[in-house]
């Protein structure tokens, strides 16, 4: 019979012959022959192959380097790579998430518009008139100035974007 020029899915062509690919989690030890099947071996500890393949070496699981702020989100198997994520309080530098950076805090005078996630930094916004923030924080929004009137008090010191108003008693000695 004519030797094949193409093989079925999950097969590969070698020496004019269709051999079975190794299943995910296994690597190729030897190609099939006219008389023998493809020989495959399971990947070792901390190794994986995630496709039907003819690879002679398994890939090493990704190392989630703690010095880069990374931790294991999902442990790898013989068929899947390890998934790294950033430690809490840190976020990925890029989409590839090969390193992390500490979430930024919003300085006094600024409040948190959007809290940081594992893939995005804190977004800060200036406190508008009537609001203040007197702390550096990755969580605190701008707080509204205290309403002196509702406490039957008067403003003794105006508020700023960094300080609350200071309330005081009303002057009873009006002429």
């Amino acid at each position: 019979p004519e030797p094949p020029t193409a093989c079925r899915e999950k097969q590969y062509l070698i020496n004019s012959q269709c051999c079975s690919l190794c299943q995910p989690g296994q690597k190729l030890v030897s190609d099939c022959t006219e008389f023998t099947e493809t020989e495959c071996l399971p990947c070792g500890e901390s190794e994986f192959l995630d496709t039907w393949n003819r690879e002679t070496h398994c890939h090493q699981h990704k190392y989630c380097d703690p010095n880069l702020g990374l931790r294991v989100q999902q442990k790898g198997t013989s068929e899947t790579d390890t998934i790294c994520t950033c430690e809490e309080g840190w976020h990925c530098t890029s989409e590839a998430c090969e390193s992390c950076v500490l979430h930024r805090s919003c300085s006094p005078g600024f409040g948190v518009k959007q809290i940081a996630t594992g893939v995005s930094d804190t977004i800060c916004e200036p406190c508008p008139v009537g609001f203040f923030s007197n702390v550096s924080s990755a969580f605190e929004k701008c707080h509204p100035w205290t309403s002196c009137e509702t406490k039957d008090l008067v403003v003794q010191q105006a508020g700023t974007n960094k300080t609350d108003v200071v309330c005081g008693p009303q002057d009873r000695l009006r002429a």
Partner: antibody
């Protein structure tokens, strides 16, 4: 091999600006922020801030806001720091360091003198 | 800002002996998720700083195991056993739990 190659020494006049560079090689430039650190002669280290080459995000030490501007260029894998309105207080060696603080440039010496 | 204090400006040591360098922070460096963010660096004369220890006690790649770090909260120690001539330089601690990151003033290791 990871390397950070910084530009050469600068002698500048008070009031002028200076822009120094830090060229990265041996790793994916956009995967790490680049920190900048100041060291005055015979003194300790001071953190200036960082630039994230992936999205051009920056974060500055309040003390250096208005003094330092951090940028980067993905195409050349280079981070930059510009210092403005220079005074004698800005005379120092400036280092760039990769985001894990595991690799540092050799430093750029800036001398401000009339 | 967090203030990092290295009380001893210098420590003299005889080669082959052990030495400890201390560092204190004005605020705990323990993050709410449980990790403590303190680096140790060595700056040899005329060179750039190099990382020795990260997260208090983890040895950085390529650093001899004569170096070790310990401590928690606000008090930290770098220990060098069997000091060698090449260990001379200034040792800095640095916190990176909160912006701006801050360094200690440095401790100079001198050979007797």
């Amino acid at each position: 091999e990871v390397q950070l190659q910084q530009s050469g020494p600068e002698l500048v006049k008070p009031g002028a600006s200076v822009k120094m560079s830090c060229k990265a090689s041996g790793y994916t430039f956009t995967s790490y922020v680049m920190y900048w650190v100041k060291q005055k002669p015979g003194q300790g280290l001071e953190w200036i801030g960082y630039v994230n080459p992936y999205n051009d995000g920056t974060n500055y030490n309040e003390k250096f806001k208005g003094k330092a501007t951090l940028t980067s260029d993905k195409s050349s894998s280079t981070a930059y720091m510009e210092l403005s309105s220079l005074t004698s207080e800005d005379s120092a060696v400036y280092y760039c360091a990769r985001g894990a603080m595991d690799y540092w440039g050799q430093g750029t010496s800036v001398t401000v003198s009339s | 800002d967090i203030v990092m204090t290295q009380a001893a400006p210098s420590v003299p040591v005889t080669p082959g002996e052990s030495v400890s360098i201390s560092c204190r922070s004005s605020k705990s460096l323990l993050h709410s998720q449980g990790n403590t963010y303190l680096y140790w660096f060595l700056q040899r004369p005329g060179q750039s700083p190099q990382i020795l220890i990260y997260r208090v006690s983890n040895l950085a790649s390529g650093v001899p195991d004569r170096f070790s770090g310990s401590g928690s909260g606000t008090a930290f120690t770098l220990r060098i056993s069997r000091v060698e001539a090449e260990d001379v330089g200034v040792y800095y601690c640095m916190q990176h739990v909160e912006y701006p990151f801050t360094f200690g003033s440095g401790t100079k290791l001198e050979i007797k």
